[in-house]
Interface confidence: medium
Amino acid sequence: RWRQQWSGSGTTSRFPETVLARCVKYTEVHPEMRHVDCQSVWDAFKGAFISKYPCNITEEDYQPLVKLGTQTVPCNKTLLWSRIKDLAHQFTQVQRDMFTLEDMLLGYLADDLTWCGEFNTFEINYQSCPDWRKDCSNNPVSVFWKTVSRRFAETACGVVHVMLNGSRSKIFDKNSTFGSVEVHNLQPEKVQALEAWVIHGGREDSRDLCQDPTIKELESIISKRNIRFFCKNIYRPDKFLQCVKNPEDSSCLSGISASHHHHHH
């Protein structure tokens, strides 16, 4: 039968099985989440997009799922990231007491997956799904990440860290999830400071990327929200990870890196 053709790739193969299996694995490795009924989680996930027009999904659609996946990160332990997911995840796998969104149940379930349904049928669309740019922004995947990213930022407290990619033309991008959602949902009553870690790409790159105009823009946005801003250059990400793994290594200087460290009030 006729099915709308979208510009984006279709739902990830074996999507229901993948979500359910990830949920079971997550609750096994995080005994603190054992009260979560994975079948109910899948039902709530499915309910957010199945039989709905995939360009008209709302944050409200995901509220039952968000309620089931309620989790809170301890203060000072939230790590946000923008355009540098792999290093952020490598970091939290070593620094086990810090958490990215993908270390939380809902982020873990959906990481790297695509999904959508279609209006008035209970089928999952494995052929194509709406592309954010070419089709619509209110698609199931984009709205999901906007919803859970908002909540993740809202519940953060203490000093929040963000890892930014220093190799990109826009180190801080206002159109990224971090720039458009998370920055604006940090709560000044709970968050004392945002500390940006700018990750350098080139091995011999000794520039102070904390002086980049886009970082100044981020500083301005954060300061206007009454949150203090700090910035660090991470010149050698490989060294950085090694020193997180083994802080006693003689070549590891005190702190995260031998970098310029800027305090902005």
């Epitope: 694995k25 096994e28 490795v29 995080h30 005994p31 603190e32 054992r34 009260h35 979560v36 309620k67 089931l68 309620t70 989790q71 809170t72 990160v73 301890p74 086990r96 007491d97 958490f99 270390d103």
Partner: antibody
């Protein structure tokens, strides 16, 4: 600092119910599971279950289902455990305990315990 | 349920010597690179106190005389050297699977 303050000792008749409390302070009550553990000279330590005050989710040891009921009042940061149809087997010290949270699912903080004595 | 069997049930060790307590699980408590086994110390009239978490990690503030080792089904708590204050009952506990279970306890007496 994290503190768990439990209600005082109870002497109760066989067949009755008892409800004990565990008042939490020094942390966000809704962010961490509250566990309950039973201690008897014969059985040692037994895990009863836990409640997640953030959404009221519970997880019981099958052995205590129908015997223990866990609830939480977020306005007073207090967790409760009710034990029903008491018998001499329920005479024990009951502890509330909190884990370290995400990736730290072991008992880091404990209440001082509530002694329950069942009389016939 | 995963049954944890501790041995010995009690032991007496001279001051300054080594105490070794064993905990055997009825099935593996390892999962995704972690051994979900923890050790507690309990003194009369007090709640248990966490010593070792995830098989071998020393809890903050616990003296380095305490150490944990083992994987899958066999775990060991070692106290070396033993001090007078170590007289207590020691419990292992798993939370790899529900219900979370404790061992029967080992009572340590200092000679």
């Amino acid at each position: 600092q994290v503190q768990l303050q439990q209600s005082g000792a109870e002497l109760v008749r066989s067949g009755a119910s008892v409800k004990m409390s565990c008042k939490a302070s020094g942390y966000t009550f809704t962010s961490f599971n509250m566990h309950w553990v039973k201690e008897t000279p014969g059985q040692g330590l037994e895990w009863i279950g836990y409640i997640y005050p953030g959404n009221g989710g519970t997880n019981y040891n099958q052995k205590f289902k129908g015997k223990a009921t866990l609830t939480a009042d977020t306005s007073s940061s207090t967790a409760y455990m009710q034990i029903s149809s008491l018998t001499s087997e329920d005479s024990a010290v009951y502890f509330c305990a909190r884990t370290g949270g995400l990736r730290r699912a072991y008992f880091t903080y404990w209440g001082q315990g509530t002694l329950v004595t069942v009389s016939s | 349920d995963i049954v944890l069997t501790q041995s010995p049930a009690s032991l007496a060790v001279s001051l300054g010597q080594r105490a070794t307590i064993s905990c055997r699980a009825s099935e593996s408590v390892d999962s995704y690179g972690n051994g979900f086994m923890h050790w507690y110390q309990q003194k009369p009239g007090q709640p248990p106190k966490l010593l070792i978490y995830l098989a071998s990690n020393l809890e903050s503030g616990v003296p380095a005389r305490f150490s944990g080792s083992g994987s899958r089904t066999d775990f060991t708590l070692t106290i070396d050297p033993v001090e007078a204050d170590d007289a207590a009952t020691y419990y292992c506990q798993q939370n790899k699977e529900d219900p979370w279970t404790f061992g029967g306890g080992t009572k340590l007496e200092i000679k």
